[in-house]
């Protein structure tokens, strides 16, 4: 058993049929010695008396808010949560496996630039009695500071019969140099509590590997005389690291109709303009990627051909 | 030989071209190592990230873009920063700074060249003959060093009398390649920046 936060404790249980469970001793936080009784949750049934209460925690029915009283007055609370371990593996029931970029990916993180600011998000089908807390650091043995905000519900989607909820959090490395060469990864730890179930999820990454620039901005078309070709130009996104001559981007320019299956014109360039063939009912799209370190491409920025 | 000066002359372009070749070569070599050594811990997640130039050169700091010198975090990231002495930073004599930057890059290349050559000599003794260093990568390191045009004491190639542990050597190769790729990215960024300015 360990303390998650003040008056909240996590009991780690090997979860299998007829498991013996864990013996837990609760101590009432009071100078009083006599006349103390214990109850669980909203029940008025007295579980025991005395300053300490010894319980055998085997299942979720044994978890919850234990309260010690004296003469109708509440003295203190202890909330017990369960963390299940099945076949040596901690449970991951609360969050959905996003399976990208690989299986068992519960947390996904992205950064728009090298400033040390990044966003992580996760998915769940649970809508109520759910809380998250996020901590982060650079490295684990001698951790350097990363400050994370509160996790918030950022999107709701309908997937078949189920509703899916996306939560996200923004974090900022306390003293980040955009030009630095990372040797220690960022560690992100998410504590998830659903009702009386506790789970924790972690992700470890270098900022350079989670870079995904914003789409290029200010796309403009200029038809070329006596030609089917158009010159398309754009600018670096405002959120990209500066100076741009140091943090350079490369671009993919594509002309395509509404359907992915339609034929296309595609060209790659390090410049902020390109010449392509425009077709009726097609769109010109441009996306960006770090020129020197191939992490993710940005989303597409698009303009219609006509 | 003269120290390079910070005039945007065509002399910088060969360095940019060579640095692009360098990044390409080390990326290809790393990809080859990952494929060939698929049963060894050779991915970014699996290896320890070591920097053989740590405390010996200070390329990131010496080559910091002017725009980032106002960022405290960029100046404090290493004890041996070339540019934290106040007068240098205040005036930032570009040609002097650029010389420091390029000489730091040169020293990086020299250190990696020695490590890679030593390692290749060991890998050539491996009866499995599983992986060797791409001669193209070694040639590209050499070309960029020549383009940088610095005189420097030659570092003797390390020789070892003991029987090499090929498993350890291959893991060390992965660690070196990952670190060198990261440094090659920095070098490419620096050359692009210098070329533009």
């Amino acid at each position: 058993i360990w303390e998650l936060k003040k008056d909240v404790y996590v009991v780690e249980l090997d979860w299998y049929p007829d498991a013996p469970g864990e013996m837990v001793v609760l101590t009432c936080d009071t100078p009083e010695e006599d006349g103390i009784t214990w109850t669980l949750d909203q029940s008025s049934e007295v579980l025991g008396s005395g300053k300490t209460l010894t319980i055998q925690v085997k299942e979720f029915g044994d978890a919850g808010q234990y309260t010690c009283h004296k003469g109708g007055e509440v003295l203190s609370h202890s909330l017990l949560l369960l963390h299940k371990k099945e076949d040596g593996i901690w449970s991951t029931d609360i969050l959905k496996d996003q399976k990208e970029p690989k299986n068992k990916t519960f947390l996904r993180c992205e950064a728009k630039n090298y400033s040390g600011r990044f966003t992580c998000w996760w998915l769940t089908t649970i809508s109520t009695d759910l809380t998250f807390s996020v901590k982060s650091s650079r490295g684990s043995s001698d951790p350097q500071g990363v400050t994370c905000g509160a996790a918030t519900l950022s999107a709701e989607r309908v997937r078949g019969d189920n509703k899916e909820y996306e939560y996200s959090v923004e974090c900022q490395e306390d003293s980040a140099c955009p030009a630095a060469e990372e040797s220690l990864p960022i560690e992100v730890m998410v504590d998830a509590v659903h009702k009386l179930k506790y789970e924790n999820y972690t992700s470890s990454f270098f900022i350079r590997d989670i870079i995904k620039p914003d789409p290029p901005k200010n796309l403009q078309l200029k038809p070329l005389k006596n030609s089917r070709q158009v010159e398309v130009s754009w600018e670096y996104p405002d959120t990209w690291s500066t100076p741009h001559s140091y943090f350079s981007l490369t671009f993919c320019v594509q002309v395509q109709g509404k359907s992915k299956r339609e034929k296309k014109d595609r060209v790659f360039t390090d410049k902020t303009s390109a010449t392509v063939i425009c077709r009726k009912n097609a769109s010109i799209s441009v996306r960006a990627q770090d020129r020197y370190y191939s992490s993710s491409w940005s989303e597409w920025a698009s303009v219609p051909c006509s | 030989r003269n120290l390079p000066v910070a005039t945007p002359d065509p002399g910088m372009f060969p360095c940019l071209h060579h640095s692009q070749n360098l990044l390409r070569a080390v990326s290809n070599m790393l990809q080859k190592a990952r494929q060939t050594l698929e049963f060894y811990p050779c991915t970014s997640e699996e290896i320890d990230h070591e920097d053989i130039t740590k405390d010996k050169t200070s390329t990131v700091e010496a080559c910091l873009p002017l725009e980032l010198t106002k960022n405290e975090s960029c100046l404090n990231s290493r004890e041996t920063s070339f540019i934290t002495n106040g007068s240098c930073l205040a005036s930032r004599k570009t040609s002097f700074m650029m010389a420091l930057c390029l000489s730091s890059i040169y020293e990086d290349l020299k250190m990696y060249q020695v490590e890679f050559k030593t390692m290749n000599a060991k890998l050539l003794m491996d009866p499995k003959r599983q992986i060797f260093l791409d001669q193209n990568m070694l040639a590209v390191i050499d070309e960029l060093m020549q383009a940088l045009n610095f005189n420097s004491e030659t570092v003797p190639q390390k020789s070892s009398l003991e029987e090499p542990d090929f498993y350890k050597t291959k893991i060390k190769l992965c660690i070196l390649l990952h670190a060198f790729r990261i440094r090659a990215v920095t070098i490419d960024r620096v050359m692009s920046y210098l070329n533009a300015s």
Epitope: R261, E262, K263, K264, V267, F268, T269, D270, R279 | -
Partner: antibody, heavy 118, light 107 residues
């Protein structure tokens, strides 16, 4: 699967014209761009131009501008390349090729040998 | 127009050996570079597109790399069926242009 079958070999006199056909099958004809590339005996490859069968748009290499015409017949899924004012150095194998991407060549026809000789 | 230069013109390699073919562009073409293989009496066949993207059905021993002006096609271990002429082609701008080819022959 996607297939391109070209017309047979031709022998032409200098100054004459030649029209080579390329019949497509295995895909919706208007879904792919069609290019023509030629190869003189023992020489390399030379791009001549492309046509979009969907709308008849064409782009020709400057070298062939004014001397080449590329057309398509969507009813028969056939592309045509006509080269006029033939010279002896037009002697080559002419390939048609198709791709969903405009700028490179995925599926090739078997080639048509055109010999220009007096 | 962009001029593509391939080297060497002929490469003599023993089966099982590695072959490295070069292609240089007269100006920067990013990764708009494609490789083809042509055997005598046959049409060319696309091997690699956009400098390094492999085509399904093409053996993994064919490996493309490069960007800007310098590109390489590497055949890691030559098989008898790999002896052919290899062409690079740029798609950065029209007119599309090919290199002069590299003939890979048996040593």
């Amino acid at each position: 699967q996607v297939q391109l079958v070209q017309s047979g070999a031709e022998v032409k006199k200098p100054g004459a014209s030649v029209k080579v056909s390329c019949k497509a099958s295995g895909y919706a004809f208007t879904d792919y761009y069609l290019h023509w590339v030629r190869q003189a005996p023992g020489q390399g490859l030379e791009w001549m131009g492309w046509i979009d069968p969907e709308n008849g748009d064409t782009e020709y290499a400057p070298k062939f501008q004014g001397r080449v015409t590329m057309t398509t017949d969507t009813s028969t899924s056939t592309a045509y390349m006509e080269l006029r004012s033939l010279r002896s150095d037009d002697t080559a194998v002419y390939y048609c090729n198709a791709n969903k991407e405009l700028r490179y060549f995925d599926v090739w026809g078997q080639g048509t040998m055109v010999t220009v000789s007096s | 127009e962009i001029v593509m230069t391939q080297s060497p013109a002929t490469l003599s390699v023993s089966p099982g050996e590695r072959a490295t073919l070069s292609c240089r562009a007269s100006q920067s073409i990013s990764i708009n570079l494609h490789w083809y293989q042509q055997k005598p009496g046959q049409a060319p066949r696309l091997l690699i597109y956009f400098a390094s993207q492999s085509i399904s059905g093409i053996p993994a021993r064919f490996f493309g790399s490069g960007s800007g002006t310098e590109f390489t096609l590497t055949i890691s271990s030559l098989q008898s069926e790999d002896f052919a002429v290899y062409y690079c082609q740029q798609s950065n701008s029209f007119p599309l242009t090919f290199g002069g080819g590299t003939k890979v022959e048996i040593k």
